[in-house]
């Protein structure tokens, strides 16, 4: 089963993938699909997956979805939302990914890999 504590290498690989799909990108990611904004202070991997898993048919984030699935200790399915969701706030996938990226880089620099 997936480890609840992703190693630093896995986190770095996730950061690199998020960079890959956002670098110099101005066109709407996933055709401008909207996802629920999440609270980035705790349980970020599962919360991010719970939000992004509701986006289908977007090849650009499929690898990210798979990587997040490996970081989350429990099974996540579409339509599932934790209390980490920011109530009634949706943002574009591109902004979600950029916000997530900034946060994950902060965690990496602080040595917080879980």
């Amino acid at each position: 089963s997936p480890s609840p504590v992703p190693p630093s290498t896995a986190l770095k690989e996730l950061i690199e993938e998020l960079v890959n799909i956002t670098q110099n990108q101005k066109a709407p990611l996933c055709n401008g699909s909207m996802v629920w904004s999440i609270n980035l202070t705790a349980g970020v991997y599962c919360a991010a997956l719970e939000s992004l898993i509701n986006v289908s048919g977007c090849s650009a984030i499929e690898k990210t979805q798979r990587m997040l699935n490996g970081f989350c200790p429990h099974k996540v399915s579409a339509g599932q939302f934790s209390s980490l969701r920011v109530r009634d706030t949706k943002i574009e996938v591109a902004q979600f990914v950029k916000d997530l990226l900034v946060h994950l880089k902060k965690l990496f620099r602080e040595g917080q890999f879980n």
Partner: antibody, heavy 126, light 108 residues
């Protein structure tokens, strides 16, 4: 003061090697993506390649004319960027600039910053 | 390999509006950047992400993008704006940079 200073240019014979350095100061170098750009005498700017910050993977990309001959590296402990140039050709003669890379400027690290060095001349001639 | 195409030269009288275009197949999804280079000097960024102006760049410089075309506009061109202008972007992967061939702006 934010600045980049290149060094290591000079005259080299075709087939020879040269290593350029770019010393950075005044900003958090480790967060920055860095590029090398060259300009042949009387010609336009040509993108040579880039290196991402280590946290973004540290990966490198190169323009087709230099791929396999040039290698970009960085030493964040010394705030220095390098360009190792092997199998040099006469058409590599140019002023070589190091610069912060705008494409990597999105993630709260150095957004909107743009810095170029003064350039160093590389002449490849027999 | 991916290319960006610019006109070799543009001429305007002082006070007129100069427009320099840059075309590339990936520009609908990738940002354009514009650099000014005066003789013997390093390039200076004047527009980033299609239309954003760095601090210290005069307001007469503006940028826009539509489809496969990015445009640098200098409203009320000054003699000191005479320089070479280069557009810069990346290919569709975002991994490889490319410059346009450059446009020599003459302010007569």
């Amino acid at each position: 003061e934010v600045q980049l200073v290149e060094s290591g240019g000079g005259l080299v014979k075709p087939g020879g090697s040269l290593r350029l350095s770019c010393a950075a100061s005044g900003f958090t170098f480790s967060n920055a993506w860095m590029s090398w750009v060259r300009q042949a005498p009387g010609k336009g700017l040509e993108w040579v390649g880039r290196i991402r910050s280590e946290i973004d993977g540290g990966t490198t990309n190169y323009a087709a004319p230099v791929k396999g001959r040039f290698t970009i590296s960085r030493d964040d402990s010394k705030n220095t960027l390098y360009l190792q140039m092997n199998s040099l050709k006469t058409e590599d003669t140019a002023v070589y600039y190091c610069a912060t890379d705008q494409v990597g400027a999105y993630y709260g690290d150095y957004y909107g910053m743009d810095v170029w060095g003064q350039g160093t001349l590389v002449t490849v001639s027999s | 390999s991916y290319e960006l195409t610019q006109p070799p030269s543009v001429s305007v009288s002082p006070g007129q509006t100069a427009r320099i275009t840059c075309s590339g197949d990936a520009l609908p999804e990738k940002y354009a950047y514009w650099y000014q280079q005066k003789s013997g000097q390093a390039p200076v960024l004047v527009i980033y992400e299609d239309s954003k102006r760095p601090s210290g760049i005069p307001e007469r410089f503006s940028g826009s993008s539509s489809g496969t075309m990015a445009t640098l506009t200098i409203s009320g061109a000054q003699v000191e704006d005479e320089a070479d202008y280069y557009c810069h972007s990346t290919d569709s992967s975002g991994n490889h940079g490319v410059f346009g061939g450059g446009t020599k702006l003459t302010v007569l």
